[in-house]
Amino acid sequence: EVEKTACPSGKKAREIDESLIFYKKWELEACVDAALLATQMDRVNAIPFTYEQLDVLKHKLDELYPQGYPESVIQHLGYLFLKMSPEDIRKWNVTSLETLKALLEVNKGHEMSPQVATLIDRFVKGRGQLDKDTLDTLTAFYPGYLCSLSPEELSSVPPSSIWAVRPQDLDTCDPRQLDVLYPKARLAFQNMNGSEYFVKIQSFLGGAPTEDLKALSQQNVSMDLATFMKLRTDAVLPLTVAEVQKLLGPHVEGLKAEERHRPVRDWILRQRQDDLDTLGLGLQGGIPNGYLVLDLSMQEALS
């Protein structure tokens, strides 16, 4: 907290400009009018104020707007946004997408901070819905934001947003989310050639159905085991030994190390032991020779 001291003669700020960087903290407190600051907030961003000086400017705005800043001020906070706490942000009513973009721009290239998470939450609540434009904006700045959304919210994500997604951004997505994202990714990347397509679609394959995995097995993609282990168990089970061998290519040898883990374990249980033996990996647990395989789920469907 800066002491209340009188502004020295001739130092009263008539406008927010670069000369203020030479003011000591107590001079900023004494000589800058909060109302002037509020009306000229857009200038602050271009001025290299120190972290400590920004503290004083924030304090002045807090005194002027104890109930929370108006959107006209919020939109022009610039780097002063970095000084805001989630508690400050919860007092705001942010409804303009331009305001959201302006503040996300300040944090661009950095991890999503608690301030940004709170801002997004306030914005979405203020709008009452997560519309396409909002999602477009959020996924452009934070592709990882996708995994924090429910499958219902994800359904309105435009396929064009998928292009910004990096593999690590999907690390926290669960299968239900990937089920929604995969068809969008398939649509987004549909015009790419085989190998390029696989590179892009690989991160989304946790949502792929059996028929798409079968199609990929015909394209010499050489899927790595880490990707294979993230596939939906129900999508992997119908694959034949030959199809899995083609899908994994040289990585097929990795199945041995994963034979006790899903989906490999469950897949092994569905294969004929004779077929598994053709891989030469010593995989055990397949259906013994001469046994008849009844698909009970199919039988129930017919009756």
């Epitope: 670069e18 961003n45 271009a46 001025i47 290299p48 104020f49 120190t50 972290y51 920004l54 780097y79 002063l80 970095l82």
Partner: nanobody, 117 residues
Amino acid sequence: QVQPVESGGGLVQPGGSLRLSCVVSGSDFTEDAMAWYRQASGKERESVAFVSKDGKRILYLDSVRGRFTISRDIDKKTVYLQMDNLKPEDTGVYYCNSAPGAARNYWGQGTQVTVSS
């Protein structure tokens, strides 16, 4: 965010000169105004010189005006501070920064300037 790298400090007698350099690699140097700051032991960090992004607007702290000269070389991504007629009260660690860096409290190591006989 790449931190600035300052150099050129040293021990100098009163009335002497030094030229400080600050290299800001990896950022969009042309986008930001830059400033030189200094911090004396136990004192608040203060701004001593400012140069706008186009290099046309230059401002100084009252106590250094006429003795210090700030300039920038866009091609070399470098900001300079020519310090002449140095005084003991100019002693401190000198830093340079841009608005984004200063706002995020990202600072380089600084360069020590000591003015003493």
